[in-house]
Structures are given as structure tokens and as C-alpha cells.
């Protein structure tokens, strides 16, 4: 399979964010981060990770979702969603279900 060459100590990842110096980057793992800032549409950033692997294990919130993967270009086709927020009138357990 030409899309799975032998793994080296670094992976090549798709890079799509304001911080990218080119269309790809190399790192210890690939990342996708979905961030929603106040009053703005969510922004999805793709890149490389080398530090703070613990971020990869964080649960999605209504403001951020952090995804990590460990093979070449594995972050290219990943799409993330944010945790849905529930309006105060729809608290869990009050709808009879």
C-alpha cells in the first residue's frame, strides 16, 4: 500500500493553520484542533505535535476538541465536533425519558 510506508521516528502531517510554514509539517504525532472563540465560528487547525501529549486525551468541550494520531497524513480527513451545550430549559432528566 503506497500510503503506508515504513514508520520513522517522525510522522508527516497535513498543516493547515495560521502558524504553518508550508502545507505539511513533521512531528511526533499529527493533530487536529477545533476551537470556538466567543462570538465566532469554530476554526479547525491541522498540524504537528511534539509537546504536551496529555492534550490528546482531553475530553471535548463546547469550546475545544483536540485530536491526535500517529501515522503519516492521518490528520488530513478528520473532522471534529464540539460538545453540544444544553439550554437551561432542557436539563437532563426533565423531559420524561
Amino acid at each position: 500500500d503506497p500510503v503506508k510506508p515504513s514508520r520513522g521516528p517522525l510522522v508527516t502531517c497535513t498543516c493547515e493553520s495560521p502558524h504553518c510554514k508550508g502545507p505539511t509539517c513533521r512531528g511526533a504525532w499529527c493533530t487536529v484542533v477545533l476551537v470556538r472563540e466567543e462570538g465566532r465560528h469554530p476554526q479547525e487547525h491541522r498540524g504537528c505535535g511534539n509537546l504536551h501529549r496529555e492534550l490528546c486525551r482531553g475530553r471535548p468541550t463546547e469550546f475545544v476538541n483536540h485530536y491526535c494520531c500517529d501515522s503519516h497524513l492521518c490528520n488530513h480527513n478528520v473532522s471534529l465536533v464540539l460538545e453540544a451545550t444544553q439550554p437551561p430549559s432542557e436539563q437532563p432528566g426533565t423531559d420524561g425519558q
Partner: antibody, heavy 117, light 107 residues
Framework: EVQLLESGGGLVQPGGSLRLSCAAS????????MSWVRQAPGKGLDWVSA????????YYADSVKGRFTISRDNSKNTLFLQMNSLRAEDTAVYYC??????????WGQGTLVTVSS | AIQMTQSPSSLSASVGDRVTITCRAS??????LGWYQQRPGKAPQLLIY???ILQSGVPSRFSGSGSGTVFTLTISSLQPEDFATYYC?????????FGQGTKLEIK
Amino acid sequence: EVQLLESGGGLVQPGGSLRLSCAASGFAFNSFAMSWVRQAPGKGLDWVSAIGGRGGSTYYADSVKGRFTISRDNSKNTLFLQMNSLRAEDTAVYYCASQPTPPFDYWGQGTLVTVSS
Amino acid sequence: AIQMTQSPSSLSASVGDRVTITCRASQDIRNDLGWYQQRPGKAPQLLIYATSILQSGVPSRFSGSGSGTVFTLTISSLQPEDFATYYCLQDYNYPCNFGQGTKLEIK
């Protein structure tokens, strides 16, 4: 089998235009950043341009910025290079390549562009 | 743009020799440097990426080292098929840049 097949080269007068195409097969084209690299007769390699897998990010060498446009059609697995305002110094073999996406290393065999009056 | 200076421009050596080619960057490029081999009339082939990672299928007599601004490609024992032209390429920052090339010839 991975294949990259360039086409569209030929003889053009200074100031003229050409559009190069590169048909890709055998790999997940839409996941790959792609590049054009050229080589003038008897000279070294010259990086020209690159484009991200989704086509949203493009990059150019200073020598071609404003004259060349890289693009891609992922539905047709094809990479393009629109070359305008061509100069004699643009004469070269133009290669389409998967660089900069190591460890994947896919190159076409090149198409010759000659700019001459 | 980052400039890459490759030396020597040509090199004569014999089968079995150890040879070293050097590439210098005009600014720090971390380890974002690759080495390509090109035989006459053929497309280039990637030998090494990220300074020292050997591309799949490339013989272990090829090795790369360096960091920052100075990088080397070493062929530990030249084989007849190694006589070709070698190029470095920085892809730390775009636009990318190749070195001028080193033509390796039989002595």
C-alpha cells in the same frame, strides 16, 4: 502502482502562456501536498511551487510569484500549473512531485517547456 | 528566502571510497532538510528526509547528519550506482530551496 504523468509542455514565445497538467493515480491524491520542480537544461533542481491537499494553501518561489498559479482538481486527481508572462529563463523540464510529503516520494518523468522566439 | 549552499559542486572518487557532501543554510532550519539523488535523464529520488531518516529502500551506506544550519550526506563505501548528482532541499520554510547540487564522478 503510483503514477504521475505531466503534460502541456511545448514551445512558447516570451510573454506567452502555458498550462501544465499532472495526472495522478495509485495513491490518495487528495491527502497529499503536491509540488512543481523544474530543471533547466544542464542545470540544477529549482523548486517552483507547492499546494496543500485541499488546495487552500499555495506557495511560490520568488522567481515565479505573480506569474505562475498552482491549482488542483481532487475530483480528477490532477495538479495544474498555469504559467503566464513566460521568460527565456523559465525554459526547463517541469516535474510534478509529491514532495514535500516525505516519506512519500512520487515524481513524474517531466515535461519540457521551451520559451524562445 | 532561505538560501542553501552546497559543497563541493563536483567530486571525483573511487568505488569503495567514503564521501561527504555538505549543505549550509542561511538561517536555522532545525532538521527540515532532505537529500535527493538524480541520475542523468531521470527524475530525482529521495534518499534521506528530516536530516537523518533513511527513505524506505535506500541502502544503509547512505546517512545524514546535522542540525540548524550545517548538514552532511555521507556515503560510507561508494558503489558504481552511486555516481550521480546529489541535492539538498530545505522545507522548513516556504519557498523551499534546493542546494546547487554535487556531481559525483568516477575518478
